[in-house]
């Protein structure tokens, strides 16, 4: 099974005719407390823009990016280096559609590290590419303090101690 070819989430060539390939994506909680249901049609439409990128075996493709889901567990910093060694980075989530894609492909309900940590230098939550988190889109549950790193669970972002060991997601 080459998941890199989009087998797990078939929206090839922007076509979503095979309805049996989809599960319900479910609700996503946004910062103001309102909910919006992300449909499979939304997910497919958002992917139709870029069908040319091919990911490696073991990597999933979505919206022109490649995603790798770990099976083992590491601290946030070890996960960060692991992705770096693969010339990728810990997951940066840009919007709810991407969060829905991630959640759809997480086969467990435990915490998963993402590329977001609290930097004491900036005193703010910062993605690994240096950009700040958009508080209008995402709310982080838990303390914003030194040695806090972000993990996702059931489409929500939580503040956790960076030395905790969780699974992680790399992206390029």
């Amino acid at each position: 099974l080459l998941v890199s070819q989009g087998v797990l989430l078939k929206c090839q060539k922007g076509s979503c005719s095979n309805a049996t390939q989809y599960e319900d994506t479910g609700d996503l909680k946004v910062n103001n407390g309102t909910r919006r249901n992300i449909s499979n049609k939304d997910l497919c439409a958002s992917r139709s823009a870029d069908q040319t990128v091919l990911c490696q075996s073991e990597w999933l493709k979505y919206q022109g990016k490649c995603y790798w889901f770990s099976n083992e567990m590491k601290s946030w910093s070890d996960s960060y280096v692991y992705c770096l060694e693969r010339k990728s980075h810990l997951l940066i989530i840009h919007d709810q559609l991407e969060m829905a894609f991630i959640q759809k492909n997480l086969r467990q309900l435990n915490y998963v590290w993402i590329g977001l940590n609290f930097t004491s230098l900036k005193m703010t939550w910062t993605w690994v590419d240096g950009s700040p988190i958009d508080s209008k889109i995402f709310f982080i549950k838990g303390p914003a303090k030194e040695n806090s790193c972000a993990a996702i669970k059931e489409s929500k972002i939580f503040s956790e101690t960076c030395s905790s060991v969780f699974k992680w997601i790399c992206q390029y």
Epitope: S4, V53, C55, Q56, W59, W68, V81, E85, K87
Partner: antibody, heavy 117, light 110 residues
Framework: SLEESGGDLVQPEGSLTLTCTAS?????????MCWVRQAPGKGLEWIGC????????TYYASWAKGRFTITKTLSTTVTLQMTSLTAADTATYFC?????????????WGPGTLVTV | DVVMTQTPASVEAAVGGTVTIKCQAS??????LAWYQQKPGQPPKLLIY???TLESGVPSRFRGSGSGTEFTLTISDLECADAATYYC????????????FGGGTEVVVK
């Protein structure tokens, strides 16, 4: 630039350590230093790489695991330790650097050093 | 391990002609493929990376294409200086990382 040294004539079942020395840059950045070999008249064969970042992770071809060990010894040197050598290990050994950018490519190569078993 | 299979082993063409070298990966490697040129007694020289990006200073007569498992190096307007052995090299980046080479293609220019 890169330069390999330590190539020699060695007896079967013997051991040898090759050194790769960098000039013009140090291994303080995060990239891969790799070893590749080429038997006389044959093709290139990847041996393994070491990541020069804090983790110092090493990756080897399946056939090289156990007999070959790559180590970063100083800020400008990487070594390849080879044990239980056989005639099949006779080759020119190259060290190469995989650029630190987001792209995978060996953009700097040494001239090679000959190992004869 | 990922295996890179290169064809043909040898190809002959006239000056001004075109040669095509193919490289196949046993698993998808995305666009993580490089092409090298090697002449006798010299280390390999990088020509193309990320399947199709020309290394600085390499003439545009060299063109790389492909992604996933199928890749091609095309050399057009052949010159005598192009006589060499060409290697593809994939990079596999998942649980482990490997950089396997293809077996090489000798290009003879008549």
């Amino acid at each position: 630039s890169l330069e390999e040294s330590g190539g020699d004539l060695v007896q079967p079942e013997g051991s040898l350590t090759l050194t790769c020395t960098a000039s013009g840059f140090s291994f303080s950045g995060s990239y891969y230093m790799c070893w590749v070999r080429q038997a006389p008249g044959k093709g290139l064969e990847w041996i393994g790489c070491i990541y020069t970042g804090s983790s110092g992770s090493t990756y080897y071809a399946s056939w090289a695991k156990g007999r070959f060990t790559i180590t970063k010894t100083l800020s400008t040197t990487v070594t390849l330790q080879m044990t239980s050598l056989t005639a099949a290990d006779t080759a020119t050994y190259f060290c190469a650097r995989d650029t630190g950018s987001t792209y995978w490519r060996y953009n700097i190569w040494g001239p090679g050093t000959l190992v004869t078993v | 391990d990922v295996v890179m299979t290169q064809t043909p082993a040898s190809v002959e063409a006239a000056v001004g002609g075109t040669v095509t070298i193919k490289c196949q990966a046993s698993q998808s490697i995305g666009s993580d493929l490089a092409w090298y040129q090697q002449k006798p007694g010299q280390p390999p020289k990088l020509l193309i990376y990320t399947a199709s990006t020309l290394e600085s200073g390499v003439p545009s007569r060299f063109r790389g294409s492909g992604s996933g498992t199928e890749f091609t190096l095309t050399i057009s307007d052949l010159e005598c200086a192009d006589a060499a052995t060409y290697y593809c090299q994939g990079t596999y980046r998942s649980s482990s990382i490997s950089w396997p080479f293809g077996g090489g293609t000798e290009v003879v220019v008549k």
